[in-house]
């Protein structure tokens, strides 16, 4: 069977004017992911995003994440999106520093 | 096992529209991309667009003014439309499913295509 | 976009010769690189993902390399299965975009 991943999307300040968005996705099962970023609903090129590798997170399951750098105000613009498994959602970034969790149910 | 199929009208006269059906067995619409590429005659391929599991689409922009991709999740379909066809347009049209994990983007499964000539 | 350059758009070998294909970008992909080998009837399959990954079902005798903007396909001991067409295609930059191209024939 699968695990649907736990999608947590975060921000840091990067440099002025500039934040790092990072969406990361753990205890999901299998391994194979998608997740990527939007701006304005269109995907952001390859070269643009930085991904982890896909890691065994020690439960039978598996973790990753991808980062992007975007302007500080722009962040209602940019949504990571996740599939897996037939499964599929969009994460916002949230406002200050506060953190979104959200897990999937099949 | 994966399979696409293409069909299309064969010959469409200049400045009409072209439609195109990809049908896909043994994978789920909602859980991939499905990427549109076209080959002219006797030249290479080019990537005209794709639509991801959540019905979200990217199109190349040299051509997003005039093509539309959509589908239907219950019927295992991916639809092509494309506008004011000119006899460039005049080419073999691939589905192709895609494979996107981190930093791997591939087509993985190809459809075998279906020829489109825009002649009067 | 980025254009994608293969220099030699045929070329000719003998079975059993090691037979290398390239490709250039016209800036760097970092590794961004795919292979798809075309028969003559026009099936398309994948090679070589990442550059350097020979996807599931493909004879150990196709291998990539390459980085930055360079890459290069080679079939070790040419098969008469391989005659066909080889395209590399960059996904580094939205659209992805082909080469034009390689025809192996056999000599």
């Known amino acids: 069977g699968s695990v649907p991943p736990m999608v947590n999307v975060t921000r840091s300040e990067a440099s002025e004017g500039n934040i790092t968005v990072t969406c990361r996705a753990s205890s999901f099962y299998p391994r194979n992911i998608t997740l990527t970023w939007r701006q304005d609903g269109v995907s952001l090129s390859h070269d643009t995003q930085q991904w982890g590798d896909v890691l065994p997170d020690g439960n039978g399951t598996y973790q990753t994440w991808v980062a992007t750098r975007i302007c500080q105000g722009e962040e209602q613009r940019f949504t990571c999106y996740m599939e897996h498994s037939g499964n599929h959602s969009t994460h916002p970034v949230p406002s200050g520093n506060s953190h979104h969790h959200h897990h999937h149910h099949h | 096992q994966v399979q696409l199929k293409e069909s299309g009208p064969g010959l469409v006269a200049p400045s009409q529209s072209l439609s195109i059906t990809c049908t896909v067995s043994?994978?789920?619409?909602?859980?991939?991309?499905v990427n549109w590429v076209r080959q002219p005659p006797g030249k290479g391929l080019e990537w005209l667009g794709m639509?991801?599991?959540?019905?979200?689409?990217d199109y190349n922009s040299a051509l997003k003014s005039r093509l539309s991709i959509s589908k239907d999740n219950s019927k295992s379909q991916i639809f092509l439309k494309m506008n004011s066809l000119q006899t460039d347009d005049t080419a073999r049209y691939y589905c192709?499913?895609?494979?996107?994990?981190?930093?791997?983007?591939?087509?993985?499964?190809w459809g075998a295509g279906t020829t489109v000539t825009v002649s009067s | 976009d980025i254009q994608m350059t293969q220099t030699t758009s045929s070329l000719s070998a003998s079975l059993g010769d090691r037979v290398t294909i390239s490709c250039s970008a016209s800036?760097?992909?970092?590794?961004?690189l795919n292979w798809y080998q075309q028969k003559p009837d026009g099936t398309v399959k994948l090679l070589i993902y990442?550059?350097?990954s020979l996807h599931s079902g493909v004879p150990s005798r196709f291998s990539g390399s390459g980085s930055g903007t360079d890459y290069s396909l080679t079939i070790s001991n040419l098969e008469p299965e391989d005659i066909a067409t080889y395209y590399c295609?960059?996904?580094?930059?939205?659209?992805?975009?082909f080469g034009g191209g390689t025809k192996v024939e056999i000599k």
């Open positions: 800036q760097g992909i970092s590794n961004y």
């Open positions: 990442y550059t350097s």
């Open positions: 043994g994978f789920s619409l909602t859980g991939s991309g």
């Open positions: 639509i991801w599991g959540d019905g979200n689409t």
């Open positions: 295609q960059q996904y580094s930059k939205l659209p992805p975009t």
């Open positions: 192709a499913r895609g494979a996107y994990y981190g930093k791997r983007w591939y087509f993985d499964v």
